[in-house]
């Protein structure tokens, strides 16, 4: 698809700068830089600076793109399902189902057998089959804590529905705790949400596995009913030690790339000074920004290579997506707020995906 | 950086298939396919199939990668800040601050001036500066609804802290409602979380803008205090009509690409049959999967091109990240659960990022 040449770093930087020139105008839907002829003299109005700073603060607190996946996410996860302890178990006697709560207990030894170390756990979900629901219901999930107290985990607003539907709650942190503690039985509570004013909230939602059934129906239901369960995804124990080995994949981010001599795909430093690099005076804040860019080969790995075990270890770094022609591209990106004038009016606008924080072979 | 040749589609497919061979083994950390010598005859055990189906269901309900950003996300957002209506306004008289709630009201005409149409709103946040906090506090945010009722929006578990900190709540949907309704004043309530059992929950957290201050301190506080505000990001009104124009960016996904003759970057169809394409019998479920792949040029756009307005419209499609050498790579990916045997033991494992759903120039 392509033939490699020696990379002219200066040409790449020039092309990136020219591309940014077009990108900014394109994002603002401007055919040309706005004229500065009407801009009032003096500093930016205080209110505009306050707004710009608010936007900058917002950016500082959250990355626009998801974090790069940790190395463990590349590898296959073994899937395990642990069903809820049957409701006739004595553990349920201590926790009478009230009008606003139902309780679900799980045998942690089953989980521990599948996931011997907490660090191996990648994701755990509590899955409940909710039956048809006549009214909107706001439910909360709690985790059983020591001395019979309950710790709030999350909530869900359930829309009315005529058909059953699986609900899934992310309980990764909780299951990780269970695995690191010694307990045998651990539990969840699903409750109606109560506000401090109204106290009469009843749990309207029926969860499969708790219905009252009689006679033959009961045994059929038991056989076929899809009771609450925990679905766990974990790295198999035998692969765990390799996670900490020298072969682990690096994050191709600014921390690593700016301080290394990496020749392969990496994020490269590039500061754009609006005035010097683009000849622009019309962006009043900031004066420039760290745009950065991705550069470096992503060698295609021939899986028929005889040194196969070595080759496999390289996949994660150089071709995790099994592309026919892997390419070094941005992974984590961040937005850039700017202040500029249109006529006499100062504007604060946020441009998405402007700063390259890390790269990946894709 | 690269010189283009005519693309040999069959070679690309072969390279993709070979890459997948290595990718799957690499994800499973296997140096070679597992032997099938000990696999018991007959169909897969029911429990294993049930587990495989659970995993498949989970995948159906959620994509591993974020959704491709809508076209509007590419363009700059104008940022506006609307401060809370001052607490001496008569609106607050109807809502006495209780021990478990504080109220915040906003003038929607200010918002409507900045964002004339609800569809233009991209994101809105309610931002509150919380002062130091001695104990953990679980708070809930409510939206004022018609007839003085309150609708639950979200909650936050606040950790104890010695320093002030901005809290941010996503209120995009709420502000969109405000913009489409005719109201003048709209509001939020921040309350302590109450469970159905305990009734004594007091709001311990101090939010800047509600403290009782006297004398000179009060006027200083008023001037410098950072009161609650709504931060709105929206497409400028004058750019709105262009959103619906013929030039809009296509999602380079299976829906579009499989039914078009697009020569540029697009997702291309590729079904991998484990037995036929890879010569593998060891994966028991599924028999194959739609791996797909990305292919097609992402023309580098010279921003100095004279036909500039046409060029700018192409940026969003061909080089949204302003790369020096844009490349056609996967955007949305999905996982693949598989069933295979290790010795006599069946395993259900999930492989991340195996199915290419859409592509992008990056």
């Amino acid at each position: 698809l392509s033939t490699c040449k020696t990379i002219d770093m200066e040409l790449v930087k020039r092309k990136r700068i020219e591309a940014i020139r077009g990108q900014i105008l394109s994002k603002l839907r401007l055919a040309s830089p706005p004229s500065q002829g009407e801009v009032p003299p003096g500093p930016l109005p205080e209110a505009v600076l306050a707004l710009y700073n608010s936007t900058r603060d917002r950016v500082a607190g959250e990355s626009a793109e998801p974090e790069p996946e940790p190395e463990a996410d590349y590898y296959a996860k073994e899937v395990t399902r642990v069903l809820m302890v049957e409701t006739h178990n004595e553990i349920y006697d201590k926790f009478k189902q009230s009008t606003h709560s139902i309780y679900m207990f799980f045998n942690t030894s089953e989980l521990r057998e599948a996931v011997p170390e907490p660090v191996l756990l990648s994701r755990a979900e509590l899955r409940l089959l909710r039956l048809k629901l006549k009214v909107e219901q706001h439910v909360e999930l709690y985790q059983k804590y020591s001395n019979n107290s309950w710790r709030y985990l999350s909530n869900r607003l359930l829309a009315p529905s005529d058909s059953p539907e699986w609900l899934s709650f992310d309980v990764t942190g909780v299951v990780r705790q269970w695995l690191s503690r010694g307990g045998e039985i651990e539990g969840f509570r699903l409750s109606a949400h109560c506000s401090c004013d109204s106290r009469d909230n009843t749990l309207q939602v029926d969860i499969n596995g708790f219905e009252q059934q009689r006679g033959d129906m009961q045994s059929i239901a038991k056989k076929h009913r899809r009771v609450p369960y925990v679905l766990a995804m974990a790295l198999p124990a035998e692969r765990a030690n390799e996670l900490h080995s020298a072969r682990r994949r690096r994050d191709l981010d600014t921390d690593y790339c700016f301080s290394s001599t990496e020749k392969n795909c990496c994020v490269r430093q590039l500061y754009i000074d609006f005035r010097k690099d683009l000849g622009w005076k019309w962006i009043h804040e900031p004066k420039g920004y760290h745009a950065n860019f991705c550069l470096g080969p992503c060698p295609y790995i021939w899986s028929l290579d005889t040194q196969y075990s070595k080759v496999l270890a390289l996949y994660n770094q150089h071709n995790p997506g099994a592309s026919a022609a892997p390419c070094c591209v941005p992974q984590a990106l961040e937005p850039l707020p700017i202040v500029y004038y249109v006529g006499r009016k100062p504007k604060v606008e946020q441009l998405s995906n402007m700063i390259v924080r890390s790269c990946k072979c894709s | 950086l690269s010189t283009c040749k005519t693309i040999d589609m069959e070679l690309v497919k072969r390279k993709r298939i070979e890459a997948i061979r290595g990718q799957i083994l690499s994800k499973l950390r296997l140096a070679s396919p597992p032997s099938q010598g000990e696999v018991p005859p007959g169909p897969l055990p029911e429990a294993v199939l049930a587990l495989y189906n659970s995993t498949r269901d989970r995948v159906a309900g959620e994509s591993a990668e974020p959704e491709p950003e809508p076209e509007a996300d590419y363009y700059a957002k104008e940022v506006t800040r609307v401060l809370m209506v001052e607490t001496h306004n008569e609106i607050y008289d109807k809502f006495k601050q209780s021990t478990h709630s504080i109220y915040m009201f906003f003038n929607t005409s200010e918002l409507r001036e900045a964002v004339p149409e609800p569809v233009l709103l991209s994101r809105a946040e309610l931002r509150l500066l919380r002062l130091k906090l001695k104990v953990e506090q679980h708070v809930e945010l409510y939206q004022k609804y018609s007839n003085n009722s309150w609708r639950y929006l979200s909650n936050r578990l606040l950790a104890p802290s010695d320093s002030p900190e901005w809290l941010s709540f996503d209120v995009t949907g709420v502000v969109r409602q405000w913009l489409s309704r005719g109201g003048e004043i709209e509001g939020f309530r921040l309350s302590a979380h109450c469970s159905c059992d305990s009734r004594d929950n007091t709001l311990q957290v101090d939010i800047n803008g509600f403290e009782q201050q006297r004398g000179d301190m009060q006027s200083i506080a008023k001037k410098h205090r950072r009161v609650p505000y709504v931060l709105a990001m929206a497409l400028p009104a004058e750019r709105a009509n262009e959103l619906h124009s013929a030039r809009r960016r296509r999602d380079l996904d299976t829906d579009y690409c499989f039914s078009s003759t697009e020569k540029n970057c697009c997702v291309r169809q590729l079904y991998i049959d484990f037995r036929k394409d890879l010569g593998w019998k060891w994966i028991h479920e599924p028999k194959g999967y739609h791996a797909n792949f990305c292919l097609g040029p992402c023309p580098y756009i010279w921003s100095l091109d004279t036909q500039y307005s046409k060029v700018l419209a192409l940026y969003n499609q061909h080089n949204p990240g302003a790369s020096a050498a844009p490349c056609c790579v996967p955007q949305a990916l999905e996982p693949l659960p598989i069933v295979y045997y290790v010795g006599r033991k069946p395993k259900v494992e999930q492989l991340s990022n195996m199915i290419v759903r859409s592509c992008k120039c990056s």
Epitope: A31, P33, Q36, G37, E38, G279, G343 | E238, Y308
Partner: antibody, heavy 120, light 107 residues
Framework: EVKLVESGGGLVQPGGSLSLSCAAS????????MSWVRQPPGKALEWLGF??????????EYSASVKGRFTISRDNSQSILYLQMNVLRAEDSATYYC???????????WGQGTTLTVSS | DIQMTQTTSSLSASLGDRLTISCRAS??????LNWYQQKPDGTVKLLIY???RLHSGVPSRFSGSGSGTDYSLTISNLEQADIATYFC?????????FGGGTKLEIK
């Protein structure tokens, strides 16, 4: 298609007044600054002033040569631009163009012009 | 005010020729330089904005270049339809000002 059509030109005595109109179509009138430019016979073009768009509050800006005598206004409901000219002088004789102004510092569409002659 | 000077007030050329019209500003105008064409019937059209960007519908035989204070308009492969007067205009600083114009005639 963007279209600008001027009208109202004619012969006026020195010290007199006249109002020129410019009917706009084919674009969202309130989104744009609108400008007047004139050209005396055989001479260069001269920018007279503009009226800003809605986001900029429809405020006006004039060149020193006409400030105080000429007034630019707009009727947004009818998409019409006006130039009210008072205390006219012989040197105001020219072809008057209305033009759509963009924030990039240029006039992207022009009318065909209307001629004013100031003479006794 | 910024003065715009077009030193050549008239220019004679043959059909098919390549010719350049220049314009100088009295101070740096940061590329905010635009070119207009005025036909003999008085019709005015924008050709180029921001030094080198072609307005929609303008043939690609027109091109612009320059920076700082010196700018030029080039017409390659001159056609009969190009017979007109060409004005430059700065959009950097109010008041906007125009050059004196360059009248193009056929030899």
């Amino acid at each position: 298609e963007v279209k600008l059509v001027e009208s109202g030109g004619g012969l006026v005595q020195p010290g007199g007044s006249l109002s020129l109109s410019c009917a706009a179509s084919g674009f969202t009138f309130t989104d744009y600054y609108m400008s007047w430019v004139r050209q005396p016979p055989g001479k260069a073009l001269e920018w007279l002033g503009f009226i800003r768009n809605k986001p900029n509050g429809y405020t006006t800006e004039y060149s020193a040569s006409v400030k105080g005598r000429f007034t630019i206004s707009r009727d947004n409901s009818q998409s019409i631009l006006y130039l009210q000219m008072n205390v006219l002088r012989a040197e105001d004789s020219a072809t008057y163009y209305c033009a759509r102004y963009t924030g990039g510092g240029y006039f992207d569409y022009w009318g065909q012009g209307t001629t004013l002659t100031v003479s006794s | 005010d910024i003065q715009m000077t077009q030193t050549t007030s008239s220019l004679s050329a043959s059909l098919g020729d390549r010719l350049t019209i220049s314009c100088r500003a009295s101070q740096d105008i940061s590329n905010y330089l635009n070119w207009y064409q005025q036909k003999p019937d008085g019709t005015v059209k924008l050709l180029i904005y921001y030094t080198s960007r072609l307005h929609s519908g303008v043939p690609s035989r027109f091109s612009g270049s320059g920076s700082g204070t010196d700018y030029s308009l080039t017409i390659s492969n001159l056609e009969q339809a190009d017979i007109a007067t060409y004005f430059c205009q700065q959009g950097d600083t109010l008041p906007w000002t125009f050059g004196g114009g360059t009248k193009l005639e056929i030899k």
